[in-house]
C-alpha cells in the first residue's frame, strides 16, 4: 500500500522536511503533490511526468519544494504555514489513480522567555505575587524553577494559565529566592534569566545586646540594637521615654547612677510602615553592689530535685566566685557552674547539701561576699529506730519506748500496738506492765512535706521466765586465716546476764576471742580450723536461766600441701602403679593428676597397670578448694627399672 513518511515529523522552523514515499507502484505515468488531505487543482504544489522527466509547478508551489524521481518531496526553509497534510496523487500507465496522505508539524525555535511580576516589593504575610512567563507561545509547555530546583509542593504555590503563571500567596521572607521559567516545545527549550523575589518584612522584635543590665559607675555603656528587617530597619533610642538619637548603637561614656533607667530601642521599616520596640532596664551601681543569692527552689526534695543558685546582680566583665561550707567548691559531678560562673547548679540534692553557700563578686581591690544561704533540703523519714533495743521485759516494770527517724521537716510519730493506734507522740510509756502487754509495737514516722511514711515494728515479750536463747552469726562459712565471725545471743533482754561455752567448757583465754555488747556478742578473729567447735550461749536473771542449742562453726580451710602414698619412688617393670593423693581441706578438694606435665584424670587415686620404663617421670597431684578459692600441689618422681636389674626394688601394689 502506498504510504507517506514525514522525516522528521516535528520540524523546526527554517529547517527542511522530506515527505518520503513508500511502496510506489510500478508502470507509472506520473504523480502530483497537493497541500491538504485531498486532490485539489487549486492546491497543487508540483506535478511530475515520468516519460519526459519534467516537473511542473502548481498554484501552491512556493519555490522551496523539490520533487525526486522516486516521488518523494523535499520542502526547505520550513515556515509555520507549512504545518499540515500533504497528498500524493499517483497516475499509473493504465490511468488508474492511487492516493496517499502524510503530515508534519512545524514548531518555532522558541524565544528566550522573561518573567514579569505583578508586585516587585511584596510585604510578608500580606501580599501575593504572580509571576508570568513571557511571551505566550502556542504549543509551548511552561515550567518553573526555584533556586534551580523544581517547584516544592506548597499550598501557598499555585500554577495557572497553562502553568504560565506562578502565584505565591501570603509571601514570607523564606520566599526570597531565584525564580526562573522554562518553555519547551518538541524542537527547543528555553530558560529565562533569574528573578530574585524581594520580600519586605519586619522589623521583628529588636534584640538589645549585651544582655547584662547591671553596670558599675565609671564604666562605658555601649548598647547595640538589631531587628530582622527588609529593607534594614531604622533605629531610635529612648531613655526613660525621652528620645536620644537615631542610631543602631547607643554609647554613653563614664556612666553614673543617674544613667539608671529604662532604655528603649525602636526599629522602624519605612517600606512596611511597621515599628517594634524592646525595653531593657539598666542599673548603675555607685559601688560594686553587695551580691545576693537567689534560688529557683527554696524547699528541694532529696534525691529528686535540682537547685540552681544564682549570684545577683548580673554585672558586665565581672568574676563570680562560690564557697560551700566556707570552702571553695569541691569537685563533684553533682555540682555544675554556668559558663560565666554566675549560676551554681546542684543536681539531685541530698541532705548533706544544706550549705551554707556564699557567692562573691571580684573587683580590682577586693571580693564582695553575699550573705550565706542555707538550703532547706526536705528528706526522710528514714526507717525509724525504736530504743531501747530490749525485746524481753519482766512483769511489773515500766515500758518506755522512744522512736526517732531522720527527717526534714521533723517527722510526726504514731504508735500502734498489734495494729491498733495508740497515740501520736514520739515516746510511748506504759507503767507496771503485765504479760498482756506482750505484742507487736509499731512506730510510724510521717513527713508532711514529702508525704512519705516509714514504719518499724518491734516484738515485745513480757514474761517472768526467760526464753530459750538462740545464736545468730554474721558469717556461716568463714575462711581460715582470713575471716572473723561474730556470734550474737538472741534476744536482747533487760537486766539479763549473758554467758558462753565452747565444747561444753567456759571460754578459753585467747587474744582472738572478744566479748562485747554486755557479753551478748562473741567475736572470733582470724578463725582457724581448730575453731570448728560447738558454741552455746546462756542467759540468766534473778528468777530463771536458759541455754541455746549448740551452733557448730563450719570453718573453710585448705587445701593443705597434699601427700602422695605410698612413698616409694622406684618400681620394677611389670608392676602396677597405684598412687593415692590426700590433702586436708574443708570442703573436700577436687583432685587431678599430671604425668610429665600432661593432664591425666580427675580422681584421688591414679592407677596404671603393668608399668614399663616408659612410665618414668614426674607425677604431680593438684588439689583445689572451690569454697576457699585456694589451690595446692605436690610432685613425685617415679623411676621404673627393667625386671631383675637392681635389688631392693618394690614390686608395686
Amino acid at each position: 500500500k502506498l504510504t507517506i513518511e514525514s522525516t522528521p515529523f516535528n520540524v523546526a522552523e527554517g529547517k527542511e522536511v522530506l515527505l518520503l514515499v513508500h511502496n510506489l507502484p510500478q508502470h507509472l505515468f506520473g504523480y502530483s503533490w497537493y497541500k491538504g488531505e485531498r486532490v485539489d487543482g487549486n492546491r497543487q504544489i508540483i506535478g511530475y511526468v515520468i516519460g519526459t522527466q519534467q516537473a511542473t509547478p502548481g498554484p501552491a508551489y512556493s519555490g522551496r519544494e523539490i520533487i525526486y524521481p522516486n516521488a518523494s518531496l523535499l520542502i526547505q526553509n520550513i515556515i509555520q504555514n507549512d504545518t499540515g497534510f500533504y497528498t500524493l496523487h499517483v497516475i499509473k500507465s493504465d490511468l488508474v489513480n492511487e492516493e496517499a496522505t502524510g503530515q508534519f508539524r512545524v514548531y518555532p525555535e522558541l524565544p528566550k522567555p522573561s518573567i514579569s511580576s505583578n508586585n516587585s516589593k511584596p510585604v510578608e504575610d500580606k501580599d501575593a505575587v504572580a509571576f508570568t512567563c513571557e511571551p505566550e507561545t502556542q504549543d509551548a509547555t511552561y515550567l518553573w524553577w526555584v533556586n534551580n530546583q523544581s517547584l516544592p509542593v506548597s499550598p501557598r504555590l499555585q500554577l495557572s494559565n497553562g502553568n504560565r503563571t506562578l502565584t505565591l500567596f501570603n509571601v514570607t521572607r523564606n520566599d526570597t529566592a531565584s525564580y526562573k521559567c522554562e518553555t519547551q516545545n518538541p524542537v527547543s527549550a528555553r530558560r529565562s534569566d533569574s528573578v530574585i523575589l524581594n520580600v519586605l518584612y519586619g522589623p521583628d522584635a529588636p534584640t538589645i545586646s549585651p544582655l547584662n543590665t547591671s553596670y558599675r559607675s565609671g564604666e562605658n555603656l555601649n548598647l547595640s540594637c538589631h531587628a530582622a528587617s527588609n529593607p534594614p530597619a531604622q533605629y531610635s533610642w529612648f531613655v526613660n521615654g525621652t528620645f536620644q538619637q537615631s542610631t543602631q548603637e547607643l554609647f554613653i561614656p563614664n556612666i553614673t547612677v543617674n544613667n539608671s533607667g529604662s532604655y528603649t530601642c525602636q526599629a522602624h521599616n519605612s517600606d512596611t510602615g511597621l515599628n517594634r520596640t524592646t525595653v531593657t532596664t539598666i542599673t548603675v551601681y555607685a559601688e560594686p553592689p553587695k551580691p545576693f543569692i537567689t534560688s529557683n527552689n527554696s524547699n528541694p526534695v532529696e534525691d529528686e530535685d535540682a537547685v540552681a543558685l544564682t549570684c545577683e546582680p548580673e554585672i558586665q566583665n565581672t568574676t563570680y566566685l562560690w564557697w560551700v561550707n566556707n570552702q571553695s567548691l569541691p569537685v563533684s559531678p553533682r555540682l555544675q557552674l554556668s559558663n560565666d560562673n554566675r549560676t551554681l547548679t546542684l543536681l539531685s540534692v541530698t541532705r548533706n547539701d544544706v550549705g551554707p553557700y556564699e557567692c562573691g563578686i571580684q573587683n580590682e581591690l577586693s571580693v564582695d561576699h553575699s550573705d550565706p544561704v542555707i538550703l532547706n533540703v526536705l528528706y526522710g523519714p528514714d526507717d525509724p529506730t525504736i530504743s531501747p533495743s530490749y525485746t524481753y521485759y519482766r512483769p511489773g516494770v515500766n515500758l518506755s519506748l522512744s522512736c526517732h527517724a531522720a527527717s526534714n521537716p521533723p517527722a510526726q510519730y504514731s504508735w500502734l500496738i498489734d495494729g491498733n493506734i495508740q497515740q501520736h507522740t514520739q515516746e510511748l510509756f506504759i507503767s507496771n506492765i503485765t504479760e498482756k502487754n506482750s505484742g507487736l509495737y509499731t512506730c510510724q514516722a510521717n513527713n508532711s512535706a514529702s508525704g512519705h511514711s516509714r514504719t518499724t515494728v518491734k516484738t515485745i515479750t513480757v514474761s517472768a521466765e526467760l526464753p530459750k536463747p538462740s545464736i545468730s552469726s554474721n558469717n556461716s562459712k568463714p575462711v581460715e586465716d582470713k575471716d572473723a565471725v561474730a556470734f550474737t545471743c538472741e534476744p536482747e533482754a533487760q537486766n539479763t546476764t549473758y554467758l558462753w561455752w565452747v565444747n561444753g567448757q567456759s571460754l578459753p583465754v585467747s587474744p582472738r576471742l572478744q566479748l562485747s555488747n554486755g557479753n551478748r556478742t562473741l567475736t572470733l578473729f582470724n578463725v582457724t580450723r581448730n575453731d570448728a567447735r560447738a558454741y552455746v550461749c546462756g542467759i540468766q536473771n534473778s528468777v530463771s536461766a536458759n541455754r541455746s542449742d549448740p551452733v557448730t562453726l563450719d570453718v573453710l580451710y585448705g587445701p593443705d600441701t597434699p601427700i602422695i602414698s605410698p612413698p616409694d619412688s622406684s618400681y620394677l617393670s611389670g608392676a602396677n602403679l597405684n598412687l593415692s593423693c590426700h590433702s586436708a581441706s574443708n570442703p573436700s578438694p577436687q583432685y587431678s593428676w599430671r604425668i610429665n606435665g600432661i593432664p591425666q584424670q580427675h580422681t584421688q587415686v591414679l592407677f596404671i597397670a603393668k608399668i614399663t620404663p616408659n612410665n618414668n617421670g614426674t607425677y604431680a597431684c593438684f588439689v583445689s578448694n572451690l569454697a576457699t578459692g585456694r589451690n595446692n600441689s605436690i610432685v613425685k618422681s617415679i623411676t621404673v627399672s627393667a625386671s631383675g636389674t637392681s635389688p631392693g626394688l618394690s614390686a608395686g601394689a
Partner: nanobody, 123 residues
Framework: EVQLVESGGGVVQPGGSLRLSCAAS????????LGWFRQAPGQEREFVAA????????YYADSVKGRFTISRDNAKNTLYLQMNSLRPEDTALYYC????????????????WGQGTLVTVSS
C-alpha cells in the same frame, strides 16, 4: 564560565556501541542545557541530540532517533551519549555544547563548546 571535556570516543565495528561522556567544570552544571553535535571530515557541523536543564526534555536528529540516547547526571556534572547500532555514516568528531538559556538543534544557541572526541565506525 563552564569548561567541557569530551571522552569515550574510539574505533568500533558497525552495529557496535559506544558511550560518550562530557565532564563539566567551572560553574553550576544544572544551570546549563546541553547538546551533542558532530562534524564529519569536509562536512558542516550537524546536530545530534539535546537535553534541557533538569533532564526531562530531550530532542534528537532524525538520523539518530531510536539508536542514540542523551542523558545527564547533575550530581556528577556529566553529560552522556549512549550510541547503539552504530553505522559507518556516524563516523565524526563529536562535540559537547552548553547554554544557560537554550536547548535545541541550532548550534548558534550554544556559547560553550568542548574540543571533541573522535568516533570511527569501520569494519
Amino acid at each position: 564560565e563552564v569548561q567541557l571535556v569530551e571522552s569515550g570516543g574510539g574505533v568500533v565495528q558497525p552495529g557496535g556501541s559506544l558511550r560518550l561522556s562530557c565532564a563539566a567544570s567551572g560553574h553550576t552544571f544544572s544551570e546549563y542545557a546541553l547538546g551533542w553535535f558532530r562534524q564529519a571530515p569536509g562536512q558542516e557541523r550537524e546536530f545530534v541530540a539535546a537535553i534541557n536543564w533538569g533532564g526531562g526534555w530531550t530532542y534528537y536528529a532524525d538520523s539518530v532517533k531510536g539508536r542514540f540516547t542523551i542523558s545527564r547526571d547533575n550530581a556528577k556534572n556529566t553529560l552522556y551519549l549512549q550510541m547503539n547500532s552504530l553505522r559507518p555514516e556516524d563516523t565524526a568528531l563529536y562535540y559537547c555544547a552548553a547554554s544557560s538559556d537554550y536547548a535545541g538543534g541550532n548550534p548558534t544557541g550554544y556559547p560553550y563548546w568542548g574540543q571533541g572526541t573522535l568516533v570511527t565506525v569501520s569494519s
